[in-house]
C-alpha cells in the first residue's frame, strides 16, 4: 500500500541527513540553486530549484522523494512565486536549510 505521509517525511529527512554527511567534496560540486520561501507549497518549490542541478547523483533520490510531495509534474526551468529569484545559494546550504525546516514540520505533524 501507499507509504503514510509521516513515514515519507521522515524518510526524506533521513535522506537529507545522509547526503549532507556523506560528502567528501562540496555537494554537487558547489552548484548554486535559487533560494525558496519555506512556506506552503515549498515541496514543489524545492523540487523546482533542485531539478535544475544536473549530473549530481547525490541528490537524485532527494529529487524523487520531493516529487512525491508535489502534486504536479515539475521540469527543469520551471519556477514558482515561492522562489527568492534574486538569491542563489549552494546546494549544501539549500539542503541544510530545508532539513531544519522539515524537522520542525515533522514535529508539528505537518506531513504533506
Amino acid at each position: 500500500g501507499p507509504v503514510p505521509p509521516s513515514t515519507a517525511l521522515r524518510e526524506l529527512i533521513e535522506e537529507l541527513v545522509n547526503i549532507t554527511q556523506n560528502q567528501k567534496a562540496p555537494l554537487c560540486n558547489g552548484s548554486m540553486v535559487w533560494s525558496i520561501n519555506l512556506t506552503a507549497g515549498m515541496y514543489c518549490a524545492a523540487l523546482e530549484s533542485l531539478i535544475n542541478v544536473s549530473g549530481c547523483s547525490a541528490i537524485e533520490k532527494t529529487q524523487r522523494m520531493l516529487s512525491g510531495f508535489c502534486p504536479h509534474k515539475v521540469s527543469a526551468g520551471q519556477f514558482s512565486s515561492l522562489h527568492v529569484r534574486d538569491t542563489k545559494i549552494e546546494v549544501a546550504q539549500f539542503v541544510k536549510d530545508l532539513l531544519l525546516h522539515l524537522k520542525k514540520l515533522f514535529r508539528e505533524g505537518q506531513f504533506n
Epitope: E14, L16, L99, L100, K103, K104, F106, R107, Q110
Partner: antibody
C-alpha cells in the same frame, strides 16, 4: 512570574507508593505539554514521563512503565506523578518541566521547577 | 532505545572555545536541545532546535547538528560557564525523550 513548584517528596520504603504534585502559575498551563524528569544523586538527567496539553496522550520511560502514572488537572493548573512499587533505584530529585505542545513532544524544556527529593530506602 | 553519547568531561582555559559533542545514530534527523546545569540548581535551556538560542543566553553559545553528531560550542569561555551540559532529543520511534549522559565542563 512563570513558576513550577513540586511537592510530595520524602522518604519511602521499597514497594510503597508516593504521589508527587506540581503547581503551575504565571502561564496558560492547559496549552503546554508537561513532563517529569529525574536525577539520581551524582548522576545525569533521566526523562520519566510526558502528558499532552489536553491529557489525551501519555508516554513513559521503560524504567517506570507500568509503575508510574502521570496525570494533570487543567482546571487547577496541577500535574501529578503517582509512583507505585517504588524501588531503591527510583531515588532521585524529580523535576516538573514545561514544554510547548506540538504533534510530537519534541519541543525543548523551557521551564523547570526546582525539584523535590524522593528517597526510597528500607 | 535511542542512545546519545557525550564525553564525560571537557576542560578549557578562560577565553578559549569549548566544544561539547553529542553522538547518536542519524542525530541530524532530530531536533537537538542543550541544557546547562550548575550544582544544586535546575537545568537551564541554552540551545534549542539544533542552533536557536533563548533570548537570555549569551551569543557565545551556539549549536550545530549534522550526520551523527550534534555540537554545542561555547566561545570565549568564562568561569561562570563551568557546569554540566546535557543534550536531548525526542525518539519518535519509541515515543520517549532521551538525554545524553552529560558533560562536565571545567574552566581551568
Amino acid at each position: 512570574q512563570m513558576q513550577l513548584v513540586e511537592s510530595g517528596g520524602g522518604v519511602v520504603q521499597p514497594g510503597r507508593s508516593l504521589t508527587l504534585s506540581c503547581a503551575a502559575s504565571g502561564f496558560e498551563f492547559r496549552t503546554y505539554g508537561m513532563h517529569w524528569v529525574r536525577q539520581a544523586p551524582g548522576k545525569g538527567l533521566e526523562w520519566v514521563a510526558v502528558i499532552w496539553d489536553d491529557g489525551s496522550n501519555t508516554h513513559y520511560a521503560d524504567s517506570v512503565k507500568g509503575r508510574f502514572t502521570i496525570t494533570r488537572d487543567n482546571s487547577k493548573n496541577t500535574l501529578n506523578l503517582q509512583m507505585n512499587s517504588l524501588r531503591v533505584e527510583d531515588t532521585a530529585v524529580y523535576y516538573c518541566v514545561r514544554a510547548p505542545q506540538w504533534y510530537l513532544t519534541a519541543e525543548a524544556f523551557d521551564l523547570w521547577g526546582q525539584g523535590t527529593m524522593v528517597t526510597v530506602s528500607s | 532505545s535511542y542512545i546519545l553519547t557525550q564525553p564525560p568531561s571537557v576542560s578549557v582555559a578562560p577565553g578559549e572555545t569549548a566544544t561539547i559533542t553529542c553522538g547518536g545514530n542519524l542525530i541530524g534527523a532530530k531536533l537537538v536541545h542543550w541544557y546547562q546545569q550548575k550544582p544544586g540548581q535546575a537545568p537551564v535551556l541554552v540551545i534549542y532546535d539544533d542552533s536557536d538560542r533563548p533570548s537570555r543566553i549569551p551569543e557565545r553559545f551556539s549549536g550545530s547538528n549534522s550526520g551523527n553528531t550534534a555540537t554545542l560550542t561555547i566561545s570565549d569561555v568564562e568561569e561562570g560557564d563551568e557546569a554540566d551540559y546535557y543534550c536531548q532529543v525526542w525518539d519518535y520511534y519509541a515515543d520517549t525523550m532521551v538525554f545524553g549522559g552529560g558533560t562536565k565542563l571545567t574552566v581551568l
